[in-house]
Interface confidence: medium
Amino acid sequence: EAHKSEIAHRYNDLGEQHFKGLVLIAFSQYLQKCSYDEHAKLVQEVTDFAKTCVADESAANCDKSLHTLFGDKLCAIPNLRENYGELADCCTKQEPERNECFLQHKDDNPSLPPFERPEAEAMCTSFKENPTTFMGHYLHEVARRHPYFYAPELLYYAEQYNEILTQCCAEADKESCLTPKLDGVKEKALVSSVRQRMKCSSMQKFGERAFKAWAVARLSQTFPNADFAEITKLATDLTKVNKECCHGDLLECADDRAELAKYMCENQATISSKLQTCCDKPLLKKAHCLSEVEHDTMPADLPAIAADFVEDQEVCKNYAEAKDVFLGTFLYEYSRRHPDYSVSLLLRLAKKYEATLEKCCAEANPPACYGTVLAEFQPLVEEPKNLVKTNCDLYEKLGEYGFQNAILVRYTQKAPQVSTPTLVEAARNLGRVGTKCCTLPEDQRLPCVEDYLSAILNRVCLLHEKTPVSEHVTKCCSGSLVERRPCFSALTVDETYVPKEFKAETFTFHSDICTLPEKEKQIKKQTALAELVKHKPKATAEQLKTVMDDFAQFLDTCCKAADKDTCFSTEGPNLVTRCKDALA
């Protein structure tokens, strides 16, 4: 239904707190360099304006679109060109081109310092002084570093953050209460960020149809008792919500997500028996809970998939009558039977089925042609299953850090031209798949591993797009989203690469490494490992292990030495010589 004033409508629907949070996220995601104070001022102005429109929908400018109102605010910021360069050119355009222009200037890898957590006492003091400002800072800092973060979900994480601080700041030992809890929230939020970025990439590169197919597969796995029409209704609504968030329409997105959660809770009988616990929660927790609700129990009497999609004499007729609906029912039927498959795999199977029908339905004897299609799925299913087994075995043998190093070597060999920081970030993220997925029950491993890897590789592609340097990476990133992971897995050593010159300074370390937190130490060591592989792409695993063990021993010795500086300056060059010899 149309509203006289869009901004008043959203303010009324969302309430002041969520409205302000979402506007702050929107501004922070568009203009990533502005300070919190600059954005907070704009948010207050927009909120005050929204209140005037609530009081009188006919007041001046209240009938303007949200894009127009927000865009005008952003374009009125002083020194826009000095701070943002060509992004300022967006302000010469009219809506909707202006918003499109802002979207194109979102930076997936902004040059901002890492978000450092203050120590517990200081954090609790500022939280107690002004909880609203404290949470505003959190939203701003996360949103500007993750310009596609799913906004209503970020409000949920801020709420979690708030609850943790409220609880832990009342404890005697604030530090030991806060650290594990906030680390948990941070880890979940980072995974949420890469997953959402993948959804926006799917929408941006391949359109709504591709995202809707993803949603149909995912929802069919989770709600196998819902009928096809119910699944596609949910998929249609979910597509709209994600399209809005990916497009920067955060108020609409959050409002529609709340509506979808309401619909699901009012229609549990036709969706799933597992929703009640989620539906008892308040809004943000409810929507979050529904997004990761456990799979419903599969119906016991499902007929074999072959009955309708291979053996039925009218397969080609049904396909010709309404291709999208027929393929949609195939994806639905296959997915509801396979909660143990990844969404990426299900979409590959649907694509294979479609290609088979396209080919076979044009032949003289279609049934003879498509009769073997399910058998042809076998290699497509075996490939990711083998990937999971191999990688989880390796993770169990090496642990997370060792597993990350194995992946780092593998990926540096596949794409040695990629910058070392990007390779290290990717390997560390890819390596976390072990901790995240390999400890799960067998039937949950494949969906966890492959869908997580796909999201991480999407980030690799986004970073590579900015400065393309590897033909291998370009090739894998140019194809469809669901083929990316198999493409990367299939890459071998890049034979075209000319090894890097050996530079002693790359492997020269100083005593300041000793005081770094464990994570930073690991990154330093992994940076050195990637550089070694770039110097000797064909070094054996044994050679690299020798060098890395020697390196670890060197750090351990010098960090324990009485005179650390002297140790580093005398032993360092010896280490470099030994490394060169070991790799010769």
């Epitope: 009928d227 029409a229 119910e230 596609t232 249609t236 229609n267 499902l302 039927e333």
Partner: nanobody, 119 residues
Framework: EVQLLESGGGLVQPGGSLRLSCAAS????????MLWVRQAPGKGLEWVSV????????YYADSVKGRFTISRDNSKNTLYLQMNSLRAEDTAVYYC????????????WGQGTLVTVSS
């Protein structure tokens, strides 16, 4: 007992319009997706259109897309099919059916209403 009663069929000239209705009883209509199917003389059953319990989304066979509109009134337990720009090949017995939990098939259907498109 599930009952579905179609009405509104008849003889119409090519290019003309008809509106079919289907009165439902014996099940919870407002939680059931519904569809229209048709059977042309000497042919097999062909599904025409599906509608979700809430009224959206809707789906159409390619052959009727842009000409037919499915709708429902849950307060009256009634399903509708508005048919415009009718063609000779739309001649068939039209059945309304309750959409099942599985496959593009159907669980229950009525006795049908005949639509004849002829000049």
């Amino acid at each position: 007992e599930v009952q579905l009663l179609e009405s509104g069929g008849g003889l119409v000239q090519p290019g003309g319009s008809l509106r079919l209705s289907c009165a439902a009883s014996g099940f919870t209509f407002d939680t059931s997706s519904m569809l229209w199917v048709r059977q042309a003389p000497g042919k097999g059953l062909e599904w025409v259109s599906v509608i979700h319990q809430s009224g959206t989304p809707t789906y159409y066979a390619d052959s009727v897309k842009g000409r037919f509109t499915i709708s429902r009134d849950n307060s009256k337990n009634t399903l509708y099919l508005q048919m415009n720009s009718l063609r000779a090949e739309d001649t068939a017995v039209y059945y309304c059916a309750k959409f099942p939990s599985s496959r593009m098939k159907f669980d229950y259907w009525g006795q049908g209403t005949l639509v004849t498109v002829s000049s």
